[in-house]
Interface confidence: medium
């Protein structure tokens, strides 16, 4: 056969290049949250829309019960933006009747949960002061970075005050990840 004269002297197998469209990916968008009681050092997890509007999950990347489930090991880019909004934040008004009903800062954490580890791992954290902003304020916090994840890892987004999350538009508050 004509092709044989060009065959290399040793066999070499090349894995086919994987199309980007086959890689696990997800983009989740904000929905209205239902706050529940917690201790102040416990940052509640947000829940998300995963199929309507701009939201999607593809290629075995699944969303369930506030978690994005990682279907295969690899390097992933993980990102989230949470927009907070409030009515007032003068520092003198923050502690009403001795109660910290309004925070003096807002925090977003992207957390990884691995079943074999007893404690969740904080992957990314962002904090902003809300003392110096105006009476009706909006503050987005964006986080994004690459991480090596294992199959079965779970990702979630935690916030310091779920009652301040702006759930009005899907382009204001979102969460996603994709395999690089």
């Amino acid at each position: 056969l004509k092709g044989q004269e060009f065959a290399p002297s040793h066999q070499q197998v090349y894995a086919p290049l994987r199309a980007d469209g086959d890689k696990p990916r997800a983009h989740l968008t904000v929905v209205r949250q239902t706050p529940t009681q917690h201790f102040k050092n416990q940052f509640p997890a947000l829940h998300w829309e995963h199929e309507l509007g701009l939201a999607f999950t593809k290629n075995r990347m699944n969303y369930t019960n506030k978690f994005l489930l990682i279907p295969e090991s690899g390097d992933y880019f993980i990102y989230s933006q949470v927009t907070f909004r409030g009515m007032t934040s003068e520092c003198s008004e923050i502690r009403q009747a001795g109660r910290p009903n309004k925070p003096d800062s807002i925090t977003v954490v992207i957390t990884k949960v691995t079943d074999s580890y007893p404690e969740p791992t904080q992957l990314l954290m962002g904090t902003k002061s809300v003392c110096e902003v105006g009476s009706n304020w909006f503050q987005p916090i964006y986080l994004g970075a690459m991480f090596s994840l294992q199959e079965g890892d779970k990702l979630m987004v935690n916030v310091s005050d779920i009652s301040l999350v702006d759930y009005t538009k899907e382009d204001k508050t979102f969460f996603g990840a994709f395999l690089l």
């Epitope: 239902t34 706050p35 529940t36 009681q37 917690h38 201790f39 102040k40 050092n41 416990q42 001795g98 109660r99 910290p100 009903n101 005050d161 779920i162 009652s163």
Partner: antibody, heavy 123, light 107 residues
Amino acid sequence: QVQLVESGGGVVQPGRSLRLSCAASGFTFSSYGMHWVRQAPGKGLEWVAVISYDGNNKLYTDSVKGRFTISRDDSKSTLYLQMNSLRAEDTAVYYCARDPTVTLYYYYGMDVWGQGTTVTVSS
Amino acid sequence: DIQMTQSPSSLSASVGDRVTITCRTSQDIRDDLGWYQQKPGKAPKRLIYDASSLQSGVPSRFSGSGSGTEFTLTISSLQPEDFATYYCLQHNSYPPTFGQGTKVEIK
């Protein structure tokens, strides 16, 4: 007046189960988080569990996780603690206590306590 | 877990004395701390909330102070009915934790 009355305590063998109840009166039970706190004989106070005002959030101290279950029945204004696989170290007076629930987001400790019910785990 | 160090573990005092009990926490808890009084065979009773606010119905001789990691309960003039065990409680962090208690006895 605001009142909490615990019941259901008693003597039980290790490995057995017991269910404690706490009947609330004098306030809108469904608006408050509720705690269980215990006190071993001659010892200090130890927090055991909490349930949020809406029943959606339940938290436990490590030593009872997987064995104890806190629940509430707002229609009966009653708090429960189901205690399974009891151990000698669970011997204590068990108090139910109301969380002040100043906002719906945070727990604030305990402002009203019941008189307690005694649980003795012994063979 | 946040560790609570309450001191002293016991003290002897006379009626009319000024008594101070201290509670230290292993982490900053802002003012998320309460003080409780317990008499033998009775349920605890809350005296102070938010570190310094007096619970309704509690005599004004009781006061609380502090923020962050160091807190104090003061009884300005000890009365016969004040002989009891006192506990601090932090509710900032899960799990909430009590101090070991301070027993106030008659000298």
